[in-house]
Amino acid sequence: MQKGDQNPQIAAHVISEASSKTTSVLQWAEKGYYTMSNNLVTLENGKQLTVKRQGLYYIYAQVTFCSNREASSQAPFIASLCLKSPGRFERILLRAANTHSSAKPCGQQSIHLGGVFELQPGASVFVNVTDPSQVSHGTGFTSFGLLKL
Amino acid sequence: MQKGDQNPQIAAHVISEASSKTTSVLQWAEKGYYTMSNNLVTLENGKQLTVKRQGLYYIYAQVTFCSNREASSQAPFIASLCLKSPGRFERILLRAANTHSSAKPCGQQSIHLGGVFELQPGASVFVNVTDPSQVSHGTGFTSFGLLKL
Amino acid sequence: MQKGDQNPQIAAHVISEASSKTTSVLQWAEKGYYTMSNNLVTLENGKQLTVKRQGLYYIYAQVTFCSNREASSQAPFIASLCLKSPGRFERILLRAANTHSSAKPCGQQSIHLGGVFELQPGASVFVNVTDPSQVSHGTGFTSFGLLKL
């Protein structure tokens, strides 16, 4: 996409990691069939993808979760793709919502988010969910990535 | 994205095809509003997209299916994006799962998968589903593609 | 992706806008964290993205909606990504369908569409849904965009 030293390809694809933390921010790892093109994009603290160069990026996330209507809150399961730019508040870029299933013990559903956004140097993107304990971490079910246009 | 003879654009978008085969691998065709940029990506045996050049690719698939909880197995409908690299076993890149609907005769649902992956020359990607007979083949419902970064 | 004056980056990401119109075509706005790379892609009449240059584009849309099986028609909620090329009829590029939820008052669900398509100069893409009144317009829930390869 970007050729030569001036324009190296910048892309990442990271894999979900189960976490004992109670935070709503999903955890990721460079494991399995992951992608990390170079040090112009990095996975920081296992939770956010941080870019060194300004530009337009296609950013995506996929979250598979298993929930049950009776065992969950009334509110739907929501996955949010969020941005933290240097010196700025965090903001939501994309969200998706799925009502809980009536299947027992739980019903699996998958959410896909993706869009083109301008990122500043040092900007980080991360994924937030309403209930991380419901997220499926089996091979390929939950992942997160970006590519620089 | 890639300009000049050295760096031609490489992209494909193929359309689902109903199949009498009992295989779980979905069938595709170059029909309708399809894309096949050049011979650096090919649709082989109507089932896999094969690339000639090594590099990073954004690969995606969309599957719409119609199923009913009572008529289906307990297991959810799962769509898998799989990779076959030369000399290596097939492996799962991405998966999405949706529990069957209680709607009658069946309830439609759509799954979208997408991610950035490194492919070797001669690598093939294909889409596997738990029950191909449930897949919807109406215009635009089920498709598969890639683009080289 | 495309560097220099000859090959400027072309990308857009627009945000859903509630509309009093009864049309099934969704309305969009350049608001919030939107992207409009330059005048080689424009949002026309708040409803379609129009490109000036021929080429391959990755086009995507995400639609979140809230519906209830009893209050809705029997037919599922369908989102369609459509193309209008100069001098040609409109055509469907991609569709996704989700059966209505049994949750009350309504159950939220998200749809994601995306694919690589050849666009002619002056071609426009837009998003159609079966019931625009069910679409969710909260931050990040419903968006539409493209990028030129």
């Epitope: - | 295989t23 691998v25 030369p86 000399g87 290596r88 076993f89 799962i92 001669g122 | -």
Partner: antibody
Framework: QVQLVQSGAEVQKPGSSVKVSCKAS????????FNWVRQVPGQGLEWMGR????????SYAQKFQDRVTITADKSTSTAYMELSSLRSEDTAMYYC???????????WGQGTLVTVSS | DIQMTQSPSSLSASVGDRVTITCRAS??????LAWYQQKPEKAPKSLIY???SLQSGVPSRFSGSGSGTDFTLTISSLQPEDFATYYC?????????FGGGTKVEIK
């Protein structure tokens, strides 16, 4: 130690089907693929197809595509090959072979002789 | 399909001889090539995988080389138990294909 034990010799009539089994021991079944190779008397080796039990994906040689079905039962660590519409030319020794990811066929079964005769 | 051509189809050699068998693929297969030994009325046995890696338990007199389209199996010093038929096989892509075999006989 690794062993692939195949079912016994079969005599079948033309037009019928045969199902040969291959029970694996001495390794995690799902970590491998299981291939079927046949050898007509006095001739070379011919690959028929294989199954990857972990993903339940079977692949076949075009020549056998319409007649062969390869399956695996993870609970018993057994791979199966069923060949239908048998003809006299299918008289051969049928071998199963375990495949390592990236490493070819490391172990072979003892073979099952299938004779097709009216 | 990828065709595998083995040569020679047969050869006669004496104990202690250095024996070389070649295998050519009709298109590039990187290093995804295996060699097997088969004795009469027996199942094949794996010797070499990934063109040059020796299968566990196989004597070091056997070696493999090559990549792309041209491959070689070498037996540095032929032993009495090495008289057999040898097959190359590509597992680069489906359908996996074997060479026609090389029969090594006692001179």
């Amino acid at each position: 130690q690794v062993q692939l034990v195949q079912s016994g010799a079969e005599v079948q009539k033309p037009g019928s089907s045969v199902k040969v089994s291959c029970k694996a021991s001495g390794g995690t079944f799902s970590n491998f693929a299981f291939n079927w190779v046949r050898q007509v008397p006095g001739q070379g080796l011919e690959w028929m197809g294989r199954i990857l039990p972990s993903l339940d994906i079977a692949s076949y040689a075009q020549k056998f595509q319409d007649r062969v079905t390869i399956t695996a039962d993870k609970s018993t660590s057994t791979a199966y090959m069923e060949l239908s519409s048998l003809r006299s030319e299918d008289t051969a020794m049928y071998y199963c072979a375990r495949e390592v990811d990236g490493g070819g066929f490391d172990y072979w079964g003892q073979g099952t002789l299938v004779t097709v005769s009216s | 399909d990828i065709q595998m051509t083995q040569s020679p189809s047969s050869l006669s050699a004496s104990v202690g001889d250095r024996v070389t068998i070649t295998c050519r693929a009709s298109q590039g297969i990187s290093s995804w090539l295996a060699w097997y030994q088969q004795k009469p009325e027996k199942a094949p046995k794996s010797l070499i995988y990934a063109a040059s890696s020796l299968q566990s338990g196989v004597p070091s007199r056997f070696s493999g080389s090559g990549s792309g389209t041209d491959f070689t199996l070498t037996i540095s010093s032929l032993q009495p138990e090495d008289f057999a038929t040898y097959y190359c096989q590509q597992y680069n892509s489906y359908p996996f294909t074997f060479g026609g075999g090389t029969k090594v006989e006692i001179k």
